[in-house]
Amino acid sequence: APVPPGEDSKDVAAPHRQPLTSSERIDKQIRYILDGISALRKETCNKSNMCESSKEALAENNLNLPKMAEKDGCFQSGFNEETCLVKIITGLLEFEVYLEYLQNRFESSEEQARAVQMSTKVLIQFLQKKAKNLDAITTPDPTTNASLLTKLQAQNQWLQDMTTHLILRSFKEFLQSSLRALRQM
């Protein structure tokens, strides 16, 4: 697994550098997770032809993956810092069950999958510290998540491969949209 943010060789070599601000730490954390996703996507794409598949829509209908929309306040038009931050945190919390699903889906990148999951938990904590309106954040229901996980794990091999590909693709896009919005805050 890659070295967590704040522990890379550049930081070690430059002990007198200014400590990272909250925004810089969040930015770096997202970039770290994106690196992890990139490595996981490499394994997925090498293992199957899902990355070129045109049958994605079939599987996508069964997944309710978080996606950024204009109403969420994260786009330039209608940008609203608090609404957007709530959407980012809520979306990340919703992705957690899908990241749990990914845990047994990788052979050579098992550690990487765990790192993505753990780093996302840390990112959520960073963002919760930044949010003023924590009451507006809805936490997914554990029972619903448990049954969703069971359902996903019961799929046939092809659908499991497709689900893995779609989770990684959607999570990457959600993080990129979040990164873009957070840089405006």
Epitope: E24, D27, R31, L34, D35, S38, M68, C74, F75, Q76, S77, R169, K172, E173, Q176, S177, L179, R180, R183
Partner: antibody
């Protein structure tokens, strides 16, 4: 391979609206991390960023020109269109479109069109 | 807006020279700094991204360094075809801004 090409009028009268089209190939504006931007360069001067559209149709504009600019995209035609209202002689420049594509949204512009001179 | 200041404005060099072009940002932009080369009557070409990352197809004589707000583009042995204007760009925050450029010419 990746290519971008600007098209539009070469001559515009003061107060008129300029409409420029960027037609691209070799990549999709539906891929997350991809954005296409418009830039201009007056003769003998530096580059200036104008506007940018993302894979999910979010947009950014240069605040100094925001009320004059509109950027739109047509993913089916692989085109990005820039309109600039109330043209003035000081807007004489070579107008470029360029692509950025990276996971971190660093906005490094790895492919550029050939540019179109608008007077 | 983040102002990018490049120096010198013009650099007269002899082929084989090692040269350094400077770029300073008005505030810290971390590693969101890119370098472009523009030859006469051509479009800009990305040379270096994120301070020091090399770009496929760009000769290895071009390298970048720096962090925060001070950056350098180095050409370790100038070739005649390197003549042109070099721009640095802020990719950290909007509006995206460019330096005024450093013109590289032969003595």
């Amino acid at each position: 391979q990746v290519t971008l090409k600007e098209s539009g009028p070469t001559l515009v009268k003061p107060t008129q609206t300029l409409t420029l089209t960027c037609t691209f190939s070799g990549f999709s504006l539906r891929t997350s991390g991809v954005s296409v931007g418009w830039f201009r360069q007056p003769p003998g001067k530096a580059l200036e960023w104008l506007a940018l559209v993302y894979w999910d149709d979010d947009r950014r504009y240069n605040p100094s020109l925001k009320n004059r600019l509109t950027i739109t995209r047509d993913t089916s035609k692989n085109q990005v269109v820039l309109t600039m209202t109330n043209m003035d002689p000081v807007d004489t420049a070579t107008y470029y479109c360029a692509r950025s594509y990276d996971d971190y949204l660093y906005y490094a512009l790895d492919y550029w069109g050939q540019g179109t001179l608008v007077t | 807006d983040i102002v990018m200041t490049q120096s010198p404005a013009t650099l007269s060099v002899t082929p084989g020279d090692r040269v350094s072009l400077s770029c300073r940002a008005s505030q810290s932009i971390s590693d969101y700094l890119h370098w472009y080369q523009q030859k006469s009557h051509e479009s800009p070409r990305l040379l270096i991204k994120s301070v020091s990352q090399s770009i496929s197809g760009i000769p290895s004589r071009f390298s970048g360094s720096g962090s925060g707000s001070d950056f350098t583009l180095s050409i370790n042995s100038v070739e005649p075809e390197d003549v042109g204007v070099y721009y640095c760009q802020n990719g950290h925050s909007f509006p995206l801004t460019f330096g005024a450029g450093t013109k590289l010419e032969l003595k």
